[in-house]
Structures are given as C-alpha cells and as structure tokens.
C-alpha cells in the first residue's frame, strides 16, 4: 500500500471515559492535524477508517461495528460507544484515505471504573471560582452531541457523595450549578449525572469536575514586599555570612505570572562577579494567593559587598514594586588601649 502520513500516537489527547456509559469520540485528525474538516474530506471522496489495538497487544485490528444493539458505531467523524465496556481500553486509530492520499493518527482511550461516590482514576478538570464574588456558575461539561435538543434529560448534581439539595449557597439549575457566594467550603468535587432515553434504553453520563475557590479580583493588590523593610538593618562584619530574605505576597490573579528577583548595584546576580546564591521557597494560601521568599546569601561578605545596593523586585499583572535592604558594615567596638591613648593625646 502507498505511504501514509502517520501522526503517531497522540498522547496529548489521553481520552478517559466511564465504563457502561455512552462515549462519542471525534477523530483528532480534523481537530488538530489537518486544515480541512470531515465534510470537505468526505465530499472530496476520502473515506474515514477506524481500527484499534487492544491494551497490552501489538496487533492492529478492525473495530467490530456489528455488535448487538450497535454498541459501537461510526457517524461521520465520530466513533460511538453505546455504552463502553472495560475491555474497550486501547489505542484507537482513525485513517483518512483514498487511492492517492492517506493520513492517520492514533490516540489512547481508557475506560475507567468509578465507585458509588464517583471516585475514579479519571483526571478531573479544575474550575476556579472567585471567593465572595456574587453568583457564579459551573456547567456540566462534555455532554453536547449525546442527545438531540428535543430530548429533555434529567440532571442530578452531587458534591462528593452527596446529592445537592438544600445546600446553603449552591443551587442546581439543570445543566448549571449556581454558587450564590462562593466560599472556601465550596472546594471539592462536583458531579453531574445526566440521564436520557434513546431507542427504548436509558443512558447515564457522569461528569466530575473539581471546584477550587480562589482569591477575588476585588481583593487583589499589587505585590507586597514584607521583607526587606525599613525596620531591619543587616549589619555585618567582613568575613561573616550575609543572608537577606525577600518575602513577597502576591494576590491570586488568573493567568498572572508572579516574579521575584534581586539586583545588586542595579544588576542581576548572574551578571556580577560576587559569589551569591539565591534560594527560593513558595507557599500558597487556601485561595491560591502566593508568598515567595528568595534568600540572597553571600558566604563571606567583603567590606566592598557591604557598600553595595541590594534591591528586591517583584512583579505581577497588578504591578511592579521594589525595596532596598538596609545593609551596613558593623563598626568594631573600639579597643581600650587605642581609645585610652587617644584620650591622652598620644599620636
């Protein structure tokens, strides 16, 4: 057979589906690899072929589309399972071809078991809600295309193992779950179970996501440098170790990059000849505010080093700040004999 453009195994699209539930999987070729869609390909005379490799096997085999009740079927560029079974786990390949053209991609499909509280090895999407920010909603994800708009499914929402009813600030509204005012206690896993009929059968779709309550933009402030500050003076003798912490508090900001850095005499530590080490530690609050500490360390400080300017800088999407550390050379205590001699006017 002629050469086929093989995009390999697309591990970026590790698809996980629950056992005994419907699953519709679009061929990734049209979504991520080719510049045309299925309709264009179909009208150009290209055919989409599906096959798979079972888990722990090397042999590629065609997918059996003649199972009872059409358990596995193909519709346009979608592979359907009604429903999945545990042993459907494997690598699936979709190939688009005619006599002159061929392109294919494989992707892993994992059929996952869940317990009665919806716990499973499924990787969960995270939805961030702002704390105390007014009404915010989450929507039951990835249910489009499973049933026509004429079908009215029933949707039940759960938090963890518990059905959401009479919760203090969480209200189920069909496909949406409304948080009247999000609080830390709203952190957790939320599951929607969508139940719909099809050809005399009842199917369930289970979708779980993690809600993380984060700092509100109304509370967000520019970075705050807690150290160095005006109250602490780093007074050292030559030969001692100089340790200056730069501690910065960053409000949570969606998609903001938080940066902390030191300059010594206006230059980055990498650009100067002093033997400086910088160690960083990061801690997060319950609402994902961040405290970064960068400790500047000079093992054996010289009198020249003690004359330099040490400035801590911080930047986030809210702004940039800087603070200089107060560094000075410790004045040695006067030696008694010298002081006495001076007192008597000796030269």
């Amino acid at each position: 057979s002629e050469r086929c453009d093989d995009w390999g195994l697309d591990t970026m699209r590790q698809i996980q589906v629950f056992e005994d539930e419907p699953a519709r999987i679009k061929c990734p070729l049209f979504e991520h690899f080719l510049k045309f869609n299925y309709s264009t390909a179909h009208s150009a005379g290209l055919t989409l072929i599906w096959y798979w490799t079972r888990q722990d096997r090397d042999l590629e085999e065609p997918i059996n589309f003649r199972l009872p009740e059409n358990r596995i079927s193909k519709e346009k560029d979608v592979l359907w399972f009604r429903p999945t079974l545990l042993n459907d786990t494997g690598n699936y390949t979709c190939m688009l071809r005619n006599t002159t053209y061929c392109s294919k991609v494989a992707f892993p499909l994992e059929v996952v078991q869940k317990d009665s509280c919806f716990n499973s090895p499924m990787k969960l999407p995270v939805h961030k809600l702002y704390i105390e920010y007014g009404i915010q909603r989450i929507t039951c994800p990835n249910v489009d295309g499973y049933f026509p708009s004429s079908v009215k499914p029933t949707i039940t929402w759960y938090m963890g193992c518990y059905k959401i009813q009479n919760f203090n600030n969480v209200i189920p509204e069909g496909m949406n779950l409304s948080f009247l005012i999000a609080l830390i206690s709203n952190n957790g896993n939320y599951t929607c179970v969508v139940t719909y009929p099809e050809n005399g059968r009842t199917f369930h779709l289970t979708r779980t996501l993690t809600v993380k309550v984060v700092g509100s933009p109304k509370n967000a402030v520019p970075p705050v440098i807690h150290s160095p500050n005006d109250h602490v003076v780093y007074e050292k003798e030559p030969g001692e170790e100089l340790l200056i912490p730069c501690t910065v508090y960053f409000s949570f900001l969606m998609d903001s990059r938080n940066e902390v850095w030191w300059t010594i005499d206006g230059k980055k530590p990498d650009d100067i000849t002093i033997d400086v080490t910088i160690n960083e530690s990061i801690s997060h609050s319950r609402t994902e505010d961040e405290t970064r500490t960068q400790i500047l360390s000079i093992k054996k400080v010289t009198s020249e080093d003690l004359k330099r300017s040490y400035v801590c800088h911080a930047r986030s999407a809210k702004g940039e700040v800087a603070k200089a550390a107060k560094v000075k050379q410790k004045v040695p205590a006067p030696r008694y004999t010298v002081e006495l001699a001076c007192g008597f006017g000796a030269t």
């Epitope: 919760f167 203090n168 830390i184 952190n187 957790g188 150290s227 801690s283 319950r286």
Partner: antibody, heavy 120, light 108 residues
Framework: EVQLVESGGGLVQPGGSLRLSCAAS?????????MCWVRQAPGKGLELVSC????????WSASWAKGRFTISRDNSKNTLYLQMNSLRAEDTAVYFC????????????WGQGTLVTVSS | DIQMTQSPSSLSASVGDRVTITCQAS??????LAWYQQKPGQAPKLLIY???TLASGVPSRFSGSGSGTDFTLTISSLQPEDFATYYC??????????FGQGTKVVIK
C-alpha cells in the same frame, strides 16, 4: 436557628477515653463545612485540636493530637465527634466546636463548649 | 509550625481610651488573619477577618490593619462591654492555622 451544641464532657481518669459530640442545626453537613474542635485550658488561650471537611471527610490535626485524638462526623446525624484516648491531666479544658475557621467570615460559628476534666 | 505572638499579654485601660493590640506571625501569612473577642464563660466571637474586614454586627470602633507578619487590632474608644480577652488567628493555609496566646483587656 443556626447553632452548635457540644456534649459528652465530664470527669475522666488519666488514661481514660471520652467521646465528645457537637450537634449542628440550621445547616446541612453534606453541604461541606470545615468543622473544628478548639480547646481552652482553664485560664489559658485557645488551641486548635482537629478539623474535618464534612463533605469529603478530609481531616487536619495538630501534631500533638495525632494518635490520641480522632475527629469524625456523621452527616446523617449532622454531628461532629472527637474521640479522645489516653487522656492526661493537661487535656483538662473546655472543648469548643467551631465552623469555618479556615476562612472565618460572616459564616463563622462557635458552640458554647463542654468541659473535660482529667483527674484521678 | 507557625507561632502567633500577641502583645501585650494584658493591659489595663479606662473607658474612652484608645487601645492597640499587636499580633506577630513567625512567617508571612498575607492578609489571612482574624481577631476574636472572648468574655469569661462564653465562646469566642469573630470581630475582624482578612486582617481588616469587620464582621457583621461588630461596632466600627474596632479596626484591624497589617499584612505579612505584623498585625494590629485597634479599639478607638474603649466601651465597658469591650473588657475581654482578644485573640488573633492565622488561617493562610492548613500549615499556618493557629491562635495567638491572647491579650486580656482589664479595667484600670
């Protein structure tokens, strides 16, 4: 009315055990709250003992409480518990049950406390 | 573990006085600090959260300030019902949940 009522305190001998209860009313444990036990020895300050998220059951305990004190909850009874084993004289205190100490705001709530006396 | 140090441990003041209590955290806790008032035989009552936000129903003579490691509770004009013990509480994350040792405000 939203309230917390502790019970189960009393006199116990050193080495003995006791189980404290905190009955919650006016709100539903399954809705997920951060419930804690806080103690206060006579004439002393507040000390955090142990906390639990009522929905998931995830817990946190002070390092000194691990191994001797166990927090739990029964969501069907809307009740928080503290099982205290191998009790010592220094565990003598009023034990308070409190809600939402992880982000105290307008939802913060405390019970009136129950006295535990460990003495022979 | 984090240490929360309050000062003074006790203070005597008169009605109408301006009273200031400080709380120092052994590590930076951002704005995640609450203040409570406790009267003998009663449960603590929340006064201030997020370092400076007044809890509902708390008189405006109470105010809080600070961030990072240094925090202050101020009572602008002490009233007879304010004689009590005051506690700070850090709640930055589960590794920093702790109360200060308390400050007792007594009548001079």
């Amino acid at each position: 009315e939203v309230q917390l009522v502790e019970s189960g305190g009393g006199l116990v001998q050193p080495g003995g055990s006791l189980r404290l209860s905190c009955a919650a009313s006016g709100f539903d444990f399954s809705s997920n709250y951060y419930m804690c036990w806080v103690r206060q020895a006579p004439g002393k300050g507040l000390e955090l003992v142990s906390c639990i998220y009522t929905n998931s059951g995830n817990t946190w305990s002070a390092s000194w409480a691990k191994g001797r004190f166990t927090i739990s909850r029964d969501n069907s009874k809307n009740t928080l518990y503290l099982q205290m084993n191998s009790l010592r004289a220094e565990d003598t205190a009023v034990y308070f049950c409190a809600r939402d100490l992880n982000y105290p705001d307008t939802s913060n709530l405390w019970g009136q406390g129950t006295l535990v006396t460990v003495s022979s | 573990d984090i240490q929360m140090t309050q000062s003074p441990s006790s203070l005597s003041a008169s009605v109408g006085d301006r009273v200031t209590i400080t709380c120092q955290a052994s590590q930076s806790i951002g704005y995640y600090l609450a203040w409570y008032q406790q009267k003998p035989g009663q449960a603590p009552k929340l006064l201030i959260y997020r370092a400076s936000t007044l809890a509902s129903g708390v008189p405006s003579r109470f105010s809080g300030s600070g961030s990072g490691t240094d925090f202050t509770l101020t009572i602008s004009s002490l009233q007879p019902e304010d004689f009590a013990t005051y506690y700070c509480q850090s709640y930055y994350n589960s590794d920093s949940d702790a109360f200060g040792q308390g400050t007792k405000v007594v009548i001079k």
